[in-house]
């Protein structure tokens, strides 16, 4: 489903797919990521992916699609 | 073909419990977001609550601290534990399939499992 | 809390056009879906994200979303039609759907 990325970055993973376990990188506590759609105004805020909303901090993320990367999934990856 | 089956309903009195569940069928359970969907006798849908895929809760105000929803994603299935019932609890309860994430819209439900509570 | 407001009916005459409203304030800042539901039966999805239809959802089901009002629009409207169709947003984290509206098809 490609990767995953947020705005602002901060550390810990998320979920690049549904299904994938969305827990921080800390190793003291593991906190599970919870997403749900981002709303409307952030319809065209992923370029090439699909927008999540982080619950927990009301900041949208994006899944982005093969072959592209960064915050907004506006980065090609020349690698793929 | 994609498919969710409720089960569970029935008569129960006021302030006692019971468990619903929904068996899915058809697709990769564990990766939707679920909810339970409520409607009384001749009355409008009411959203009960919702389950994300790994794990976020959220519920309606009126059945937060009595209702509890988790899933069973071995088993392809859904519950609902519902504790302190009371007369408005009356309704047929519908299981339903959130499109990828919370916050999209129910493309997919079961027929619905009647619970009654009277004394 | 976020409430949708339905009319409880609307009637239409067969092969006309029936417009069913749902208010909301700001609505036009959400998506808005649309729920078919015949008696005895489970709602149906018919139309999602304001205007998209489901695949096998006839085109005579539109919807659009400005303002303060989504509106369900049934085109041609045939016996079959006859139902209650429920609007349904997102808000800080819960569904909230509308009260409902019954159509019916006259003639």
């Known amino acids: 489903d490609g990767n995953t990325t947020r705005t602002p970055e901060t550390n810990g993973s998320l979920c690049g797919a549904p299904g994938e376990n969305c827990t921080g990188t800390t190793p003291r506590q593991k906190v599970k990521t919870h997403f749900s759609r981002c709303p409307k105004q952030y319809k065209h805020y992923c370029i090439h992916g699909r927008c999540r909303f982080v619950v927990d901090e009301q900041t949208p993320s994006c899944i982005c699609e093969k072959g592209y990367f960064g915050a907004r999934c506006e980065r090609v990856d020349l690698f793929y | 073909q994609v498919q969710l089956l409720e089960s569970g309903g029935g008569l129960v009195q006021p302030g006692g419990s019971l468990r619903l569940s929904c068996a899915a069928s058809?697709?990769?359970?564990?990766?939707?977001?679920m909810s339970w969907v409520r409607q009384a006798p001749g009355k409008g849908l009411e959203w009960v609550s919702g389950?994300?895929?790994?794990?976020?809760?959220t519920y309606t105000d009126s059945v937060k601290g009595r209702f509890t929803i988790s899933r069973d994603n071995s088993k392809n299935t859904l519950y609902l534990q519902m504790n302190s019932l009371r007369a408005e609890d009356t309704a047929v309860y519908y299981c339903?399939?959130?499109?990828?994430?919370?916050?999209?819209?129910?493309?997919?439900w079961g027929q619905g499992t009647l619970v009654t509570v009277s004394s | 809390s976020y409430e949708l407001t339905q009319p409880l009916s609307v009637s239409v005459a067969l092969g006309q056009t029936a417009r069913i409203t749902c208010s909301g304030d700001?609505?036009?800042?959400?998506?808005v879906h649309w729920y078919q539901q015949k008696p005895g039966q489970a709602p149906v999805l018919v139309i999602y994200?304001?205007?998209d239809r489901p695949s096998g959802i006839p085109e005579r089901f539109s919807g659009s979303n400005s303002g303060n009002t989504a509106t369900l629009t049934i085109s041609r409207a045939q016996a079959g039609d006859e139902a209650d169709y429920y609007c349904q947003a997102w808000d800080m984290q819960s569904v909230v759907f509308g009260g409902g509206t019954k159509l019916t098809v006259l003639g």
């Open positions: 339903a399939r959130d499109y990828l994430d919370f916050g999209y819209y129910f493309d997919v």
């Open positions: 389950l994300g895929h790994v794990g976020y809760t």
């Open positions: 058809g697709f990769t359970f564990s990766s939707y977001a």
């Open positions: 994200d304001d205007s």
């Open positions: 700001k609505i036009g800042k959400k998506y």
